[in-house]
């Protein structure tokens, strides 16, 4: 399916374009430069380069990107004409990825080139909207390049509750070439993928040598006043590769792990998904580590280790505790297929 025609950009009339390494011939545009006259050439760029030619042609060998600029030809110290030269590298083939961070926002399609594109490089997103009611409609979206993020990004408008498929392709072009990405298809609702939960904190609970308290927040890009998130939590001892996964109730932003290994550092991560299973799970949050509470043994004057008061709570008969009701989680033993 071809979404649009991806062509090299047109250049201003009279502009000479070239690939790096080529030999370029510039022709002074004034009629008066024809014949056996002595023409003086000056490059208008940063380096002060000058040439004198008999006749109206200037030959530049092995041109490079830095040779881009205006070449001024003059006769008797008067400007006769300007020849713009644009040396550019054809764009690389873009690899497009599209996402939608919550059900209220537009989809964003982006591409991060492996090397900084030339200033003349432009990108446009060709899109086809496939709607069960209205059929198909084609449109184009201009894309912006961010110097900070080093990526092109384009917004595809999606209204809240829209149930439509989009097929998109990114066209990247400059004066010497153009490339299109492979077509990317997505469904407006199924593509919703939250950012990972934020500010994950893992802490020990005094008196509980096998418990870890975990808390987190919704990502900045998710507004919980409209759509709630459900979460999965996974944890493992640092030396293990296998995770235990807990599926948590909707809108629960903390949890207590009851079966951590005593005295062992654990890796914990959380991910989120829209409460009604709309879209996809977020990526797992960055790993955070925590170690359960460790009893501090006391030394008697005789040097005997003795700690009669610090019997761990789970070894005592009393299991009623403020943390006891904090999880009603479904436990799934890993390895987890993602």
């Amino acid at each position: 399916l071809v979404l649009g025609s991806c062509r090299a950009l047109e250049v201003a009339n009279g502009t000479v374009t070239s690939l790096p390494g080529a030999t370029v011939t510039l022709i002074c545009p004034g009629k008066e430069a024809a014949g056996n006259v002595t023409i003086h050439w000056v490059y208008s760029g940063s380096q002060n380069r000058e040439w004198t030619t008999t006749g109206n042609t200037l030959v530049l060998r092995d041109v490079q990107l830095s040779d881009t600029g205006d070449y001024l030809c003059s006769l008797n110290d008067h400007l006769v004409g300007t020849v713009p030269l644009l040396v550019d590298v054809p764009p690389e083939e873009p690899k497009l990825s599209c996402f939608r961070k919550n059900p209220l926002v537009n989809a964003i399609c982006e591409w991060r080139p492996s090397s900084t594109p030339s200033p003349t490089t432009k990108a446009v997103l060709f899109a086809k909207k496939i709607n069960t009611t209205n059929g198909k409609s084609d449109f184009q979206v201009p894309c912006q390049y961010s110097q900070q993020l080093k990526s092109f990004s384009c917004q595809v408008e999606i209204l809240e509750g829209d149930k439509v498929y989009h097929i998109v392709s990114l066209c990247v072009a400059n004066s010497v070439g153009s490339k299109s990405s492979h077509n990317e298809a997505f469904h407006s609702l199924k593509m919703v993928q939250p950012d990972p939960p934020a500010n994950l904190v893992v802490s020990a609970i005094p008196g509980r040598p096998r418990w870890l308290k975990v808390s987190w927040q919704h990502p900045e890009t998710w507004d919980p006043s409209y759509y709630l998130l459900q979460f999965q939590l996974r944890y493992r001892p640092v030396w293990s590769k296998e995770f235990t996964v807990l599926l948590l109730p909707v809108a629960q932003y903390q949890c207590v792990i009851h079966d951590a290994l005593r005295g062992v550092k654990h890796v914990v991560q959380v991910r989120g998904k829209e409460e009604l299973d709309l879209g996809q799970w977020s990526e797992w949050s960055p790993e955070v580590t925590g170690t359960p509470w460790i009893a501090e043994p006391r030394t008697t004057p005789a040097g005997i280790l003795w700690n009669p008061t610090q019997v761990s709570v789970e070894d005592s008969a009393n299991h009623e505790d403020q943390y006891e009701s904090s999880t009603e989680a479904t436990s799934v033993l890993a390895p987890v297929q993602e």
Partner: antibody
Framework: QSLEESGGDLVKPGASLTLACTAS?????????MCWVRQAPGKGLEWIGC???????TYYASWAKGRFTISETSSTAATLQMTSLTAADTATYFC??????????WGPGTLVTVSS | DIVMTQTPSSVSAAVGDTVTINCQAS??????LTWYQQKPGQRPKLLIY???TLASGVPSRFKGSGSGTDFTLTISDLECADAATYYC?????????FGGGTEVVVK
């Protein structure tokens, strides 16, 4: 080497007039820019146009196109033809050969007065 | 057409002073700028071409600078003989353009 303008006169509005620029000590055939510039009494310099001698290449200020015509009449003479003259065209008309580093030559000017 | 804007339109200075005249082009003219001096009843005299190159026989008290759109003519050690009107000119045969002129009065 020198240039001299001639043909300046007192004419009535709507009239036409041709000014001549004659070169001494050099000929136009070697490819020069011959330009015409005018200066109204007490005002600044105003470019009219240029001809590249030995070719049919002419350039004009946008306001001069259509009413002013520059021609090369011989290897030592160029002319400026002016039509539909108005009082605003009253000025001293200079012809100039400007070669930058190779020398700059202006005639003394010729006065054109348009008055009824 | 390119427009050349000269400032100030008139300047008065004493003998020995330094005078600066500015010329601004409405678009990039690189270094293709000429400065002329004209005294009443006389033809213009070339002072500086290519923005900064002194014409033959012109004293070094005259100095041109600038490129692109902004140019300056500086006359140092002002003399009585410098009393005149000074013009900047864009030097492209396809379109000359003169500034409005700056009258220099020597007190």
């Amino acid at each position: 080497q020198s240039l001299e303008e001639s043909g300046g006169d007192l004419v009535k509005p709507g009239a036409s007039l041709t000014l001549a620029c004659t070169a001494s000590g050099f000929s136009f055939s070697s490819g020069y820019y011959m330009c015409w510039v005018r200066q109204a009494p007490g005002k600044g310099l105003e470019w009219i146009g240029c001809i590249y001698t030995g070719s049919d290449t002419t350039y004009y200020a946008s306001w001069a196109k259509g009413r002013f015509t520059i021609s090369e009449t011989s290897s030592t003479a160029a002319t400026l033809q002016m039509t539909s003259l108005t009082a605003a065209d009253t000025a001293t008309y200079f012809c100039a050969r400007d070669l930058g580093s190779r020398g700059n030559l202006w005639g003394p000017g010729t006065l054109v007065t348009v008055s009824s | 057409d390119i427009v050349m804007t000269q400032t100030p339109s008139s300047v008065s200075a004493a003998v020995g002073d330094t005078v600066t005249i500015n010329c601004q082009a409405s678009e990039n003219i690189y270094s293709f700028l000429t400065w002329y001096q004209q005294k009443p009843g006389q033809r213009p005299k070339l002072l500086i071409y290519r923005a900064s190159t002194l014409a033959s026989g012109v004293p070094s008290r005259f100095k041109g600078s600038g490129s692109g759109t902004d140019f300056t003519l500086t006359i140092s050690d002002l003399e009585c003989a410098d009393a005149a009107t000074y013009y900047c000119q864009r030097n492209a045969y396809s379109s000359w353009a003169f500034g409005g002129g700056t009258e220099v009065v020597v007190k």
